[in-house]
């Protein structure tokens, strides 16, 4: 069964996404699995379905259970399961393990802490941040968009960080909190203007029509963990996600490698079932950090099948 764990606190908003994908135009039906009872779509209900999202506004402990979402997609309806647990608010400061999102690590050069699940909510900046239940104050802490930046990170900055924000639904406000641990790695390093190791500038890559092709964008940025370093691919100057060709995908996440002590990143562009029109596109490998951006361009050419006849 394709399921996903979600959790929240009573009297807070909780929004859960159906773990099965679908286009925005697809209808999604939600059911409470234990009773097979349909979740209403009317927003006047405290718990209601809104397309791919299931909204608890606010959540109650009794809402805990498994919810089924059925994406009414062409060919086959796709079924997913959301395992929802709503906990009572703790009276003391400790956040139990079962309420914690994944731990993130940082160093002096890289200290971003993202607020978990925030992209599901209708919120407005600024976020409020707390460490071990204390509101963060001082110039070292900067709430930027959906993450917290800590300047000059020290080992004492390790701990549990909670983000708090307000979700707005039809003029009504609901509080949301999410907590994750932050650990500090002691690292001495430096950063450089990005150096792209692959592909070579203006490289021509031979591909075969109908086969799969991979392009790797690889760049180094300095030594140690880097703050704001990234590599990515663009198609005709457009982000892959915005280009809208599902056959062409960036590999999820960036692989970090350390070559001769240098911090390097690579991003693989996968082209499934290469088509003639792919040869007309410009493929840009971009590497960027605080020093700037470097771009190497690749074009595809058709690999001529080997002539076996003499």
């Amino acid at each position: 069964k394709f399921s996903k764990q979600s959790w929240g606190l009573e009297n807070e908003a909780l929004i859960v996404r159906c773990p099965r994908q679908g286009k925005p135009s697809y209808t999604v039906d939600w059911y409470y699995s234990q009773t097979n009872k349909s979740i209403p779509t009317q927003e006047r209900n405290r718990v209601f379905a809104s397309g791919q999202l299931l909204k608890f506004l606010p959540a109650a402990v009794a809402d805990s259970g498994i919810y089924t979402c059925i994406v009414r997609s062409p060919t086959f309806n796709r079924t997913g399961y959301a395992n929802v647990t709503i906990y009572k608010k703790q009276s003391d400061c400790n956040v139990p393990d079962y309420l914690m999102y994944s731990t993130v690590s940082g160093s002096e050069k890289n200290s971003k802490i993202y607020c978990p699940t925030i992209d599901l909510y209708n919120w407005t900046a600024p976020l409020e941040w707390f460490k071990n239940c204390q509101a963060l104050q001082g110039s070292r802490y900067r709430a930027h968009k959906s993450f917290l930046v800590i300047d000059n990170v020290m080992t004492e900055d390790a701990g549990d960080y909670t983000c708090k924000f307000i979700h707005n639904e039809n003029g009504a406000n609901y509080s949301v909190t999410a907590t994750r641990s932050f650990t500090v790695k002691d690292e001495q390093g430096f950063s450089l203007f990005p150096v792209i190791g692959a592909p070579a500038q203006n490289e021509i890559k031979e591909v075969e029509i109908g086969k799969n092709a991979n392009l790797t964008c690889s760049a180094c940025f300095g030594k140690g963990t880097q703050f704001l370093a990234a590599v990515l691919w663009q198609l005709n100057g457009t982000k892959i996600t915005d280009f809208g060709e599902p056959r062409i995908q960036q590999e999820e996440g960036q692989n970090q490698s350390f070559s001769n002590g240098l911090a390097c990143l690579d991003m693989v562009l996968r082209i499934a079932d290469v088509k003639e029109e792919d040869l007309l596109l410009q493929y840009d490998c971009l590497a960027l950090n605080l020093h700037g951006l470097r771009r190497h361009t690749v074009r595809l050419s058709r690999k001529n099948p080997i002539d076996h006849h003499s």
Epitope: G22, K23, Y26, P74, T75, F76, K211, N212
Partner: antibody, heavy 120, light 111 residues
Framework: EVQLVESGGGWVQPGGSLRLSCAAS????????MYWVRQATGKGLEWVSG???????YYPDSVKGRFTISRENAKNSVYLQMNTLRAGDTAVYYC???????????????WGHGTTVTVS | DIVMTQSPLSLPVTPGEPASISCRSS???????????LDWYLQKPGQSPHLLIY???NRASGVPDRFSGSGSGTDFTLKISRVEADDVGVYYC????????FGGGTKVEIK
């Protein structure tokens, strides 16, 4: 090269079982729905089973409860376990590539050469 | 279940001349994403079927531009602008809106 190769066909008596295999190569197998489509001699095409990227399975009423489709992404393979076979199941069985990434539809764009199942 | 009906059953053609095959579905194949979930396949003698047209009118990779698909809702047409000898075989329409069902096929042969 993108290809699908079926195996496991053969002759079986009514009420018997057979397991068909399909080996995929040349594409990211785990990102695609996979289907089995059959064709009796001199007849048209009939869809008999499907499996999506997370392993959920789909069948027409004609084979439900008798046929089981499964996949092994690590081996780039899809299987069709056929039980309680009937004379009407005699056909060439094709392994077919379907929907990409849950909802990108490009038609059934890759077909195997088929494997023959005879029930008599 | 959606029923697919093709006509004609058999179509004798002359090379260089146009040809047309009709396919009708028992319910609309137009989905909310704006696509018609109707494909066309050709099965040449002794071969596996292969895809010609998907989502009503999109030519599959490597398919010559003399093949075109049109129609919406319940009525669809496959046209061959100039038939070639290599185009003989059985043509199938298939709906992919609710599971998969094929039409009975149209056999195209040279006169």
């Amino acid at each position: 090269e993108v290809q699908l190769v079926e195996s496991g066909g053969g002759w079986v008596q009514p009420g018997g079982s057979l397991r068909l295999s399909c080996a995929a190569s040349g594409f990211t197998f785990s990102s695609y729905d996979m289907y089995w489509v059959r064709q009796a001699t001199g007849k048209g095409l009939e869809w008999v089973s499907g499996i999506d990227t997370v392993g959920d399975t789909y069948y027409p009423d004609s084979v439900k409860g008798r046929f089981t489709i499964s996949r092994e992404n690590a081996k780039n393979s899809v299987y069709l376990q056929m039980n309680t076979l009937r004379a009407g199941d005699t056909a060439v069985y094709y392994c077919v590539r379907g929907i990409y990434g849950d909802f990108y539809y490009y038609g059934l764009d890759v077909w195997g050469h088929g494997t023959t199942v005879t029930v008599s | 279940d959606i029923v697919m009906t093709q006509s004609p059953l058999s179509l004798p053609v002359t090379p260089g001349e146009p040809a047309s095959i009709s396919c009708r579905s028992s319910q609309s194949l137009l989905y909310s994403d704006g696509n018609n979930y109707l494909d066309w396949y050709l099965q040449k003698p002794g071969q596996s079927p292969h895809l010609l047209i998907y989502l009503g009118s999109n030519r599959a990779s490597g398919v010559p531009d003399r093949f075109s698909g049109s129609g919406s809702g319940t009525d669809f047409t496959l046209k061959i602008s100039r038939v070639e000898a290599d185009d003989v075989g059985v043509y199938y329409c298939m709906q992919a809106l609710q599971t998969l069902t094929f039409g009975g096929g149209t056999k195209v042969e040279i006169k």
